[in-house]
């Protein structure tokens, strides 16, 4: 019996300033029960980039349709990229609980930002 895997297929993504960055993430199972969240950086100082249930993330949209059944695609798009967005982004599966606990993280995708073409 195989445990859920979090797959971030792109080790790195390069995006021109002002463009949108798509960060890919898929999982291999619908269990354990619990949410997916996106972070920039690792460790206790990591920055929450997207949490579907709580918070306001105006620059982030989900790639999969909101009505897609049995969704295993948790890719996101971040709009209007600036140099301040550079860093490594992690797709993280949580196990439902009180509170939710981190179950497994993807390997990360490094986002680099190119100068805006003149």
């Amino acid at each position: 019996e195989e445990e859920l895997q979090v797959i971030q297929p792109d080790k790195s993504v390069s995006v021109a300033a002002g463009e949108s960055a798509i960060l890919h993430c898929t999982v291999t199972s619908l269990i354990p029960v619990g949410p997916i969240q996106w972070f920039r950086g690792a460790g206790p100082a990591r920055e929450l980039i997207y949490n579907q249930k709580e918070g306001h993330f105006p620059r982030v949209t989900t790639v999969s349709e909101s009505t897609k059944r049995e969704n295993m695609d948790f890719s996101i798009s971040i709009s209007n990229i600036t140099p301040a967005d550079a860093g490594t982004y992690y797709c993280v599966k949580f196990r439902k609980g009180s509170p939710d606990t981190e179950f497994k993280s993807g390997a990360g995708t490094e986002l680099s930002v190119r100068a805006k073409p003149s």
């Epitope: 619908l30 269990i31 029960v33 989900t62 059944r69 049995e70 196990r95 439902k96």
Partner: antibody, heavy 120, light 108 residues
Framework: EVQLVESGGGVVQPGGSLRLSCAAS????????VSWVRQAPGKGLEWVST??????YYADSVKGRFTISRDNSKNTLYLQMNSLRAEDTAVYYC???????????????WGQGTLVTVSS | EIVLTQSPATLSVSPGERVTLSCRAS??????IAWYQQKPGQAPRLLIY???SRDTGIPARFSGSGSGTDFTLTISSLQSEDFGVYYC??????????FGGGTKVEIK
């Protein structure tokens, strides 16, 4: 075609035990959460328990008395019910959990149910 | 625990009439609401999920709407086979999953 078939119901005395089974087919059982929902005679639906992988969740009314488990090699869900009370009398349904988008869970397929009667 | 209140408790309707069932949540559940139909002696059947998405094979006369705390299931033209009890369920915040008390739709 998704099928869920419950078994193991019956009459049991208060304080007794019973083990329900739910045989699943027609979907990749091992990657889905599955649940038990019950319905007392003439009453509404009450969620009992859900199991993901090894993560389990219970209604307060059954916590400490009921244990949900699964055997993915047999595509079977179980509910071990101990210290049964008269108020546990109900039809017990096995249900497949479904998700939508980044949310979940609701129940998209249900078995026909098995009746548990707790009476002396 | 999120409490779901359904109204009315019972509805007597003639075939062909439009039916509107209400489900009110005690707190915001966004669109994380499902609707089920249950006929006597049968298991519940999923009709609507995500407040307004019809499950596969559900006739177009069934529609769901609402978000936040107020939700509606509408049957545009009731058929004789639509009798039964209708339940809403929230899956925004669990455990526990909670169901409404149900609305019984009787055929006049």
């Amino acid at each position: 075609e998704v099928q869920l078939v419950e078994s193991g119901g019956g009459v049991v005395q208060p304080g007794g035990s019973l083990r329900l089974s739910c045989a699943a087919s027609g979907f990749s059982f091992s990657i889905y959460a599955v649940s038990w929902v019950r319905q007392a005679p003439g009453k509404g639906l009450e969620w009992v328990s859900t199991i993901g992988a090894d993560d389990t969740y219970y209604a307060d009314s059954v916590k400490g008395r009921f244990t949900i488990s699964r055997d993915n090699s047999k595509n079977t869900l179980y509910l071990q019910m101990n210290s049964l009370r008269a108020e546990d009398t109900a039809v017990y349904y096995c249900a497949k959990d479904s998700t939508v988008g980044w949310s979940g869970d609701f129940f998209d397929y249900w078995g026909q149910g098995t009746l548990v009667t707790v009476s002396s | 625990e999120i409490v779901l209140t359904q109204s009315p408790a019972t509805l007597s309707v003639s075939p062909g009439e439009r039916v509107t069932l209400s489900c009110r949540a005690s707190q915001n559940v966004r669109s994380d609401i499902a609707w089920y139909q249950q006929k006597p002696g049968q298991a519940p059947r999923l009709l609507i999920y995500a407040a307004s998405s019809r499950d596969t094979g559900i006739p177009a006369r069934f529609s769901g709407s609402g978000s936040g705390t107020d939700f509606t299931l509408t049957i545009s033209s009731l058929q004789s086979e639509d009798f039964g009890v209708y339940y809403c369920q929230q899956y925004y915040d669990w455990p526990p999953f909670t169901f409404g008390g149900g609305t019984k739709v009787e055929i006049k």
